[in-house]
C-alpha cells in the first residue's frame, strides 16, 4: 500500500522492524548458500 | 500459546490499580503487545501498545493516566490511575501480529480472558 | 482523526441466510483491515485481515472485502454458532489515535 496514511509512528516502526526482517531472512539465505556452495 | 490478565479488582475512585498480563508459549523480545478494554454491554476501545523494545503508544484519552510497561520477559503490566466510574470495563490483553514488508499493519490476533475491574464508591 | 463507523448495529438472519456488514473508515487506510468475532463472556476473535485473508482455522462462510474506505463482512450460510457481535479494525495507525475500532453489530441468528 502507499505510505499516505501511514505515517503514523507505530507504523513507520512496523514498517522498520518488517525491513529489517525481511533482510535479516534474504542475508541468512544468501549466506547459507555461499556455504553450502563452498 | 496463551495470555492472560490478572489483578482486577473493586475499587474506589482514585484509587491506583496495575494489572498483569502474562504470556506463556511465546517470549515478548519476539512480540508486541496490547491492552484493550470493554465496558459492560459497549464495544472495545483500545488503551495502548508496548512493542518488543518497550517504546510505548497510547489512545488520545489515555492522557497519561494509564502506563504500560514490561516487568519481566513474560509479563506486562497495566498501571491505571485517577481511576472513575467510567474506567469500569473488563480489561483484555491481546498479542500483535507480525510486521511484514508488504503488511506492517497491526492486528490482535492473541486474545486473553480478560480481568474485571469495577470502580464504584 | 481517524474514525471507523459500523453499520447496521444489530441485525437478525435467519439460519441458512446471509449476513452483511459494513464497515466506514474515515480516511483511506487501503487494505489494513481486520474483523473479529465476539460471544458473550469470551474474548474477540480474529476472523479476518489484511480486508480479505482469513485467520487460521476461520470458516469460509465468513468472507471480507474491500479497500480504501469502504469494507464489507458477509457471513453466508448463517448458523446458530455465528449469533455473536462482530467488529472491524483500521491497523494503520495506533498512535495518539481515538479508537480503532468499530463500533460492533450484533448479529442474532433466528
Known amino acids: 500500500h502507499s505510505d499516505g496514511i501511514f505515517t503514523d509512528s507505530y507504523s513507520r516502526y512496523r514498517k522498520q522492524m518488517a525491513v529489517k526482517k525481511y533482510l535479516a531472512a534474504v542475508l541468512g539465505k544468501r549466506y547459507k548458500q555461499r556455504v553450502k556452495n563452498k | 500459546q496463551s495470555v492472560e490478565e490478572s489483578g482486577g479488582r473493586l475499587v474506589t475512585p482514585g484509587t491506583p490499580l496495575t494489572l498483569t498480563c502474562t504470556v506463556s508459549g511465546f517470549s515478548l523480545s519476539s512480540y508486541d503487545m496490547s491492552w484493550v478494554r470493554q465496558a459492560p454491554g459497549k464495544g472495545l476501545e483500545y488503551i495502548g501498545i508496548i512493542n518488543t523494545n518497550d517504546d510505548t503508544w497510547y489512545a488520545s484519552w489515555v492522557k497519561g493516566r494509564f502506563t504500560i510497561s514490561k516487568t519481566s520477559s513474560t509479563t506486562v503490566d497495566l498501571k491505571m490511575t485517577s481511576l472513575t466510574t467510567e474506567d469500569t470495563a473488563t480489561y483484555f490483553c491481546?498479542?500483535?501480529?507480525?510486521?511484514?514488508?508488504?503488511?506492517?499493519?497491526?492486528?490482535?490476533?492473541?486474545w486473553g480472558q480478560g480481568t474485571l475491574v469495577t470502580v464504584s464508591s | 482523526a481517524l474514525v471507523m463507523t459500523q453499520t447496521p448495529s444489530s441485525v437478525s438472519a435467519a439460519v441458512g441466510g446471509t449476513v452483511t456488514i459494513n464497515c466506514l473508515a474515515s480516511q483511506n487506510i487501503y487494505n489494513s483491515l481486520a474483523w473479529y468475532q465476539q460471544k458473550p463472556g469470551q474474548p474477540p476473535k480474529l476472523l479476518i485481515y489484511?480486508?480479505?485473508t482469513l485467520a487460521s482455522g476461520v470458516s469460509s462462510r465468513f468472507k471480507g472485502s474491500g479497500s480504501g474506505t469502504q469494507f464489507t463482512l458477509t457471513i453466508s450460510g448463517v448458523e446458530c454458532a455465528d449469533a455473536a457481535t462482530y467488529y472491524c479494525?483500521?491497523?494503520?495507525?495506533?498512535?495518539?489515535?481515538?479508537?480503532?475500532f468499530g463500533g460492533g453489530t450484533e448479529v442474532v441468528v433466528k
Open positions: 489484511r480486508a480479505s
Open positions: 491481546a498479542r500483535i501480529s507480525d510486521a511484514y514488508v508488504f503488511d506492517y499493519a497491526y492486528y490482535f490476533t492473541l
Open positions: 479494525q483500521q491497523g494503520a495507525g495506533a498512535d495518539n489515535i481515538g479508537n480503532p
